[in-house]
């Protein structure tokens, strides 16, 4: 007899977009409306919660902009938290200093993306240094991953 | 009897590189020569045409440069068009303002990459704000995707 | 009888992080400690060595910074070398010119990522123009790939 039909496993994937009511760190994300994806991964209080150990490609983009450039240092981090470890682990980080002309209207993006071995119950978050300078348009600021 | 050998499906993938005869938007791409890939996806008038619904990682990089900086706002968009929808959907976007010193020779890149749920017959394109400031070297300006 | 259990093939993947004892080009990488991954790919003298022909997503980020900006042109390249070809092939490249205010402390990242058809025995490397301006923190400067 032929083997039973293969059970097509749902791809573990997330693509979350900017949410302008973020008031503190970590950033919060839109997980329901628009071009959002969330399958086989949970979203909880700003974090993507891994429920299956394995290799994941993780990415994030943040769009910073301002009206009167003061060159405040900008940072953009993707970090991981797990109850088994006391401290957050910074997985990827981008920093910018001296990036615009004083007083000018300015805009700049930071993009991060790489492969990590993640464990069930890992929580992934995004942090920025200057929340007031982030623009949360869904096409400009986002956070995602997929299991390889 | 043993089951028939598995039919290895061709990976749906594209990597197109800059084409300097782009005269208008959307950008046009080299789809034949050099480090180009095009498999299971069609290329038509600047666009990648999806022929199988599913999850795709989509990416693009654009290299902007100029002889004498005047800080024209730069934008780099990946957008989607489908005959079922009246309006283009901007999937990812990068913007830059106040990024160089007035009068200086300058160079800067914009990188975008994320996961999207695409539908058969979706057309994906890249748009930039200042075509004359784009350098089309194959290693510097490109557009690609692959099905997860 | 039921077919033999499928042999789960190890995913070919690498994520290497910055190594501050790089003294010349190509950059050298940490391949053992920290958030490093190396599976089904070899690391040799700064290079990732492909041992199975196929499609790979290749990425790299480099974090440049300095104490006193003098706007030295920065370049960041991922290139490929194979004994069958006389010359290195630049796969991806980012360049920056006129990116900070003269005399100021500055920081900037370059990110590259795309899909390539790689052949067994291809060696992949990362090159930068100004080694002294690279910061090698593991979260900031990295090089990786995975087989699709």
């Amino acid at each position: 007899p032929s083997p039973p039909p293969e059970k097509k496993e749902l791809r573990k994937v997330a693509h979350l977009t900017g949410k302008s009511n973020s008031r503190s760190m970590p950033l919060e994300w839109e997980d329901t409306y628009g071009i959002v994806l969330l399958s086989g991964v949970k979203y909880k209080k700003g974090g993507l919660v891994i429920n299956e150990t394995g290799l994941y490609f993780v990415y994030s983009k943040v769009y910073f902009r301002g009206q009167s450039c003061n060159n405040l240092p900008l940072s953009h981090k993707v970090y991981m938290r797990n109850s088994k470890y006391p401290q957050d682990l910074v997985m990827m980080e981008g920093k910018m200093m001296s990036y615009c002309t004083t007083g000018q209207m300015w805009a700049r993006s930071s993009y991060l993306g790489a492969v990590f071995n993640l464990t069930s119950a890992d929580h992934l978050y995004v942090n920025v240094s200057e929340l007031s300078l982030v623009n949360f348009e869904e096409s400009q600021t986002f956070f995602g991953l997929y299991k390889l | 009897p043993s089951p028939p050998p598995e039919k290895k499906e061709l990976r749906k993938v594209a990597h197109l590189t800059g084409k300097s005869n782009s005269r208008s938007m959307p950008l046009e791409w080299e789809d034949t020569y050099g480090i180009v890939l095009l498999s299971g996806v069609k290329y038509k008038k600047g666009g990648l045409v999806i022929n199988e619904t599913g999850l795709y990682f989509v990416y693009s990089k654009v290299y902007f440069r100029g002889q004498s900086c005047n800080n024209l706002p730069l934008s780099h968009k990946v957008y989607m068009r489908n005959s079922k929808y009246p309006q283009d959907l901007v999937m990812m976007e990068g913007k830059m303002m106040s990024y160089c010193t007035t009068g200086q020779m300058w160079a800067r890149s914009s990188y975008l990459g994320a996961v999207f749920n695409l539908t058969s017959a979706d057309h994906l394109y890249v748009n930039v704000s200042e075509l004359s400031l784009v350098n089309f070297e194959e290693s510097q300006t490109f557009f690609g995707l692959y099905k997860l | 009888p039921s077919p033999p259990p499928e042999k789960k093939e190890l995913r070919k993947v690498a994520h290497l992080t910055g190594k501050s004892n790089s003294r010349s080009m190509p950059l050298e990488w940490e391949d053992t400690y920290g958030i490093v991954l190396l599976s089904g790919v070899k690391y040799k003298k700064g290079g990732l060595v492909i041992n199975e022909t196929g499609l790979y997503f290749v990425y790299s980020k480099v974090y440049f910074r300095g104490q006193s900006c003098n706007n030295l042109p920065l370049s960041h390249k991922v290139y490929m070398r194979n004994s069958k070809y006389p010359q290195d092939l630049v796969m991806m490249e980012g360049k920056m010119m006129s990116y900070c205010t003269t005399g100021q402390m500055w920081a900037r990242s370059s990110y590259l990522g795309a899909v390539f058809n790689l052949t067994s025995a291809d060696h992949l490397y990362v090159n930068v123009s100004e080694l002294s301006l690279v910061n090698f923190e593991e979260s900031q400067t990295f090089f990786g790939l995975y087989k699709l």
């Epitope: 009206q67 009167s68 003061n70 060159n71 405040l72 007083g103 000018q104 007031s132 300078l133 | - | 100021q104």
Partner: antibody, heavy 119, light 111 residues
Amino acid sequence: QVQLVQSGAEVKKPGASVKVSCKGSGYTFTDYTIHWVRQAPGQGLEWMGVISTYQGDASYNQKFKGRVTMTVDKSTSTVYMELSSLRSEDTAVYYCARFPDWDYAMDYWGQGTLVTVSS
Amino acid sequence: EIVMTQSPATLSVSPGERATLSCKASQSVDYDGDSYMNWYQQKPGQAPRLLIYAASNLESGIPARFSGSGSGTEFTLTISSLQSEDFAVYYCQHSRELPYTFGQGTKLEIK
């Protein structure tokens, strides 16, 4: 509460220089650029330039280039505007104003400093 | 640089009535969906006070009788029902690019 307090009135001779100070309090000083605007007697407002309180560099109105210098002392949360080679038409009230990078306009202003240039 | 032109130079209105002040820019002050136009009020011997930012947004603490409108090159400040404390000079200013420039001002006086 947010305050920008400027130094007192000055009388200068033509050809001299004047240095006006502007001290910020009640907010995180290095989060805001400081702009300088002047107003000649009975006239409108004229933008002179802006300084980064974080980085210390400035952008000036071309009209004043070479005559104006803006500096910052982060330790005292004070910005200085020095105008050299004074002429009678520089007689004006000089204002400092802060500008939040994330906003659209100068939201708080100093009380103004009258500089009189007269022989 | 962008030149701002206000009209009229002087406007005489009775208390309780509506006042409409106009400002024109020599080129568009819009970018990316926003209009970089601000309005300030100045009384004799005082520093300017921000009323409206980004063409139509009321600054915190400013009475709702003040409103702004317009986009591109043409902007309007409207005071719906003039109070005695509203008689002052009003300036428009763009913040689209450096150098910022102000209009020459409109003096609002009691009729």
